[in-house]
Interface confidence: medium
């Protein structure tokens, strides 16, 4: 595939990544699928600077990110190491609350109204942010 050198229309470029901010709500899995179909992934936050950038764009609205523990340990959807990476949880979060009866705990992470993170029920219809890296090989064939 060809290298992506600029962001698609309606995406925002920042620090060699492209971001797309939804204006509607989906369950985490549907949001995850949406990003994949765009040759992207749910946003992976790797620094305080990126956290501030995303927070600025989403405002005080619950918004899914690409972090989940549906299979046990917390994992970023792009494989970024969770244990050594950036974290911005609210106090006493994640609490992986099991009381909801959905099986497992609260398995999907989202930005809360103040930007800090919380784990929540993955079926909630929150907004989401897609991210794709510039300079990565896109799945589209090169233009001849």
């Amino acid at each position: 595939g060809s290298e992506r050198t600029c962001c698609p229309v309606n995406w925002v470029e920042h620090e060699r990544s492209c971001y797309w901010f939804s204006r509607s709500g989906k369950a985490w899995a549907d949001a995850d699928n949406y990003c994949r179909l765009e040759d992207a992934h749910l946003v992976v936050v790797t620094s305080w600077e990126e956290q501030k950038f995303v927070q600025h764009h989403i405002g005080p609205v619950n918004t899914w990110m690409g972090l989940h523990d549906q299979n046990g340990p917390w994992k970023w959807v792009d494989g970024t190491d969770y244990e050594t990476g950036f974290k911005n949880w609210r106090p006493e979060q994640p609490d992986d609350w099991y009381g909801h009866g959905l099986g497992g705990g609260e398995d999907c992470a989202h930005f809360t109204d103040d930007g800090r993170w919380n784990d929540d029920v993955c079926q909630r219809p929150y907004r989401w942010v897609c991210e794709t890296e510039l300079d990565k090989a896109s799945q589209e064939p090169p233009l001849l």
């Epitope: 709500g25 009381g99 959905l102």
Partner: antibody, heavy 120, light 107 residues
């Protein structure tokens, strides 16, 4: 104080259209999601539709999908429900209600309701 | 879609009684549940949100509990003004659905 006042109800024939309005006051309208809920005579409550605080996301009950449209006008602090292709089973009191948050957290404040009767 | 089943559909009680109404969801809904009170000819009034949080201005005789699929609304000491119909609502996701209602009548 927070207040929601519905209007626009009345008697209408099947297949015709009607637009309900809900005037909001006493709070920052643009910061809250808004719902329509209805109640058929002698029946329980039925959620109809929601619109997020900024109008970006709209969701409907299956029973009205494709026929009803929810919208809002921030300059007028007003919520609307455009009802097309009305059926006898749409006869109900229609309430507007404020979401507890931007559009996904249920209702906290309700209007007094407006009655819609669909009859030939 | 998630179904909400309330029980009983009606009950008779006396002033001073402790009354319990239950609501069951067809699947787990975490604590995304609210309770409303409605009197004849009036709009519903919010009582409880997030399963157990009391709406501002609602007297503490009302309490809610439960999580997952089973929820309870309790009125600790029934007063004349409490005779009404009570509804639960789930708001985990769309579509939101109400329970069928519980009518609390005077014995």
């Amino acid at each position: 104080q927070v207040q929601l006042v519905e209007s626009g109800g009345g008697v209408v024939q099947p297949g015709r259209s009607l637009r309900l309005s809900c005037a909001a006051s006493g709070f920052t309208f643009s910061s809250y999601g808004m719902h329509w809920v209805r109640q058929a005579p002698g029946k329980g409550l039925e959620w109809v539709a929601v619109i997020w605080y900024d109008g970006s996301n709209k969701n409907y009950a299956d029973s009205v999908k494709g026929r009803f449209t929810i919208s809002r006008d921030h300059s007028k602090n007003t919520l609307y429900l455009q009802m097309n292709s009305l059926r006898a089973e749409d006869t109900a009191v229609y309430y507007c209600a404020r979401d507890r948050d931007v559009g996904y957290n249920g209702m906290d404040v309700w209007g007094q309701g407006t009655t819609v009767t669909v009859s030939s | 879609d998630i179904q909400m089943t309330q029980s009983p559909s009606s009950l008779s009680a006396s002033v001073g009684d402790r009354v319990t109404i239950t609501c069951r969801a067809s699947q787990g809904i975490s604590n995304y549940l609210a309770w409303f009170q409605q009197k004849p000819g009036k709009a519903p009034k919010s009582l409880i949100y997030a399963a157990s949080n009391l709406q501002s201005g609602v007297p503490s005789k009302f309490s809610g509990s439960g999580s997952g699929t089973d929820f309870t609304l309790t009125i600790s000491s029934l007063q004349p003004e409490d005779f009404a119909t009570y509804y639960c609502l789930h708001y985990l996701n769309y579509p939101l659905t109400f329970g069928g209602g519980t009518k609390v009548e005077i014995k």
